[in-house]
């Protein structure tokens, strides 16, 4: 990894758990310079592998609401608007970091957690399994 | 929102910035129960809207490495393996949370940050703009 000189103005940490426990400012800074309001908003419907978004809510997690994509079909939509089963719709998944309240129900104490979410779907050529 | 009774065993927080600043345990808990080892690993190549993955590294961020998808073509791959420009490859984007070292170079002090990442690509029917 890259070694960075420590800033002398850093908060002091005498915590015996350091560096496992850190201070985090929850005032979110939004670095999304991309101001295109549409972004992926209508792709779910226009895609050849369309998907629906399902709300996943968990008050013990931050963010408490995550949207999960579920592909509508196993096949993909062809030029005629019909499902073509010679192609496969598959979910595009990503591991993301969330904060989990620990101990439970605590407003100011969290643990980092990695979860797998489905962001949308894409159309792929199927894997052909050859029988020996 | 859902009101949850506070756990009496929560760490005490006398910090004047509370609840903006919280304690976070960086020992990541991996909740990915989905044990399908393949996941999205080969979809980038098999997709009709294939993409390449680019490494984005920033030592001031946690996680320091994020992979960004970039669609290979403007169009989509058709059944003959050629690019069909009557369809569009578009990136599926997601807002994710990362931790940004604040003040810079501090090992134990962070601020939550929201960034927009491209996770993969999907093939969509183009929007037709009719000229008046």
């Amino acid at each position: 990894g890259i070694t960075i000189p420590r800033n002398p103005g850093c908060p002091n940490s005498e915590d015996k758990n350091f560096p496992r426990t850190v201070m985090v400012n929850l005032n979110i800074h939004n670095r999304n310079t991309n101001t295109n309001p549409k972004r992926s908003s209508d792709y779910y419907n226009r895609s050849t592998s369309p998907w629906n978004l399902h709300r996943n809510e968990d008050p013990e997690r931050y963010p408490s609401v995550i949207w999960e994509a579920k592909c509508r079909h196993l096949g993909c939509i062809n030029a005629d608007g019909n499902v073509d089963y010679h192609m496969n719709s598959v979910p595009i998944q990503q591991e993301i970091l969330v904060l989990r309240r620990e101990p439970p129900h605590c407003p100011n104490s969290f643990r980092l957690e990695k979860i797998l979410v489905s962001v949308g779907c894409t159309c792929v050529t199927p894997i052909v399994h050859h029988v020996a | 929102g859902i009101t949850i009774p506070r756990n009496p065993g929560c760490p005490n927080s006398e910090d004047k910035n509370f609840p903006r600043t919280v304690m976070v345990n960086l020992n990541i808990h991996n909740r990915n129960t989905n044990t399908n080892p393949k996941r999205s690993s080969d979809y980038y190549n098999r997709s009709t809207s294939p993409w390449n993955l680019h490494r984005n590294e920033d030592p001031e961020r946690y996680p320091s490495v994020i992979w960004e998808a970039k669609c290979r073509h403007l169009g989509c791959i058709n059944a003959d393996g050629n690019v069909d420009y009557h369809m569009n490859s578009v990136p599926i984007q997601q807002e994710i949370l990362v931790l940004r070292r604040e003040p810079p170079h501090c090992p134990n002090s962070f601020r939550l940050e929201k960034i927009l990442v491209s996770v993969g690509c999907t093939c969509v029917t183009p929007i037709v703009h009719h000229v008046a």
Epitope: N52, R55, S118, C121 | -
Partner: antibody, heavy 124, light 113 residues
């Protein structure tokens, strides 16, 4: 507990529109999709179509030109409209909840809860 | 449309004895991406609406007794009842949820001898 209840006129005249309502309780509308299925007297089951959690729909091609499925989330109600009916549309009509499975990334077309069904007779 | 063919159409059974129903699909129901077979079994008891017994070929729906089991892959599937009980009578349907429209078999009527 999960409940679905179909309601609507038991008799419809040929060429008119069959309209049924499915009132649901015990589950979250934003999570689940709902299908309509019918069963002609003494026959098997036939899937008509589905309305997804976001209000989008998918219909069996045989019905596409004359079927509409919609939802009124404020009333927890789904509706089925089938136009230009004939005697062949006489059946018991069911609404059913599509199964929702966490950590499974496809819409599900298995039905895990059904209404009691309502018989619609098409006759003049 | 995918044709689901069940056999037998009528099955007289003796309580305590095993029973087996076959369902054949006109196309494979195995999805290559996740190796799941998109087949379910329902039971419609007399005067009632159908109830889901098994999905993905062999996964029992919660609350379904373990005397019910499903097997098969591709185009050939079987529902087995290890020991039939009086409450198991009714019409059993298989259903595929791979291809739209999602079609059902014509049903197998199970009755006590």
């Amino acid at each position: 507990q999960v409940q679905l209840q179909e309601s609507g006129p038991g008799l419809v005249k040929p060429s008119e529109t069959l309209s049924l309502t499915c009132t649901v309780s015990g589950f979250s509308l934003p999570s689940h999709s709902v299908s309509w299925i019918r069963q002609p007297p003494g026959k098997g089951l036939e899937w008509i179509g589905i309305i997804w959690n976001n209000g989008g729909t998918d219909y069996q091609s045989a019905f596409k030109s004359r079927v509409t499925i919609s939802v009124d989330t404020s009333k927890n109600q789904f509706s089925l409209k089938l136009s230009s009916v004939t005697a062949a549309d006489t059946a018991v009509y069911y609404c059913a909840r599509n199964m929702y499975i966490t950590d499974y990334y496809y819409e599900n077309y298995f039905m895990d809860a059904w209404g009691q069904g309502t018989l619609v007779t098409v006759s003049s | 449309d995918i044709v689901m063919t069940q056999s037998p159409l009528s099955l007289p059974v003796t309580p305590g004895e095993p029973a087996s129903i076959s369902c054949k699909s006109s196309q494979s129901l195995l999805f290559s991406e996740n190796q799941k077979n998109y087949l379910a079994w329902y039971l419609q008891k007399p005067g009632q609406s159908p109830q889901l017994l098994i999905y993905w070929t062999s996964t029992r729906q919660s609350g379904v007794p373990d005397r019910f089991s499903g097997s098969g892959s591709g185009t050939d599937f079987t529902l087995k009842i290890s020991r039939v009980e009086a409450e198991d009578v009714g019409v059993y349907y298989c259903q595929q949820s791979y291809y739209t429209p999602y079609t059902f078999g014509q049903g197998t009527k199970v009755e006590i001898k």
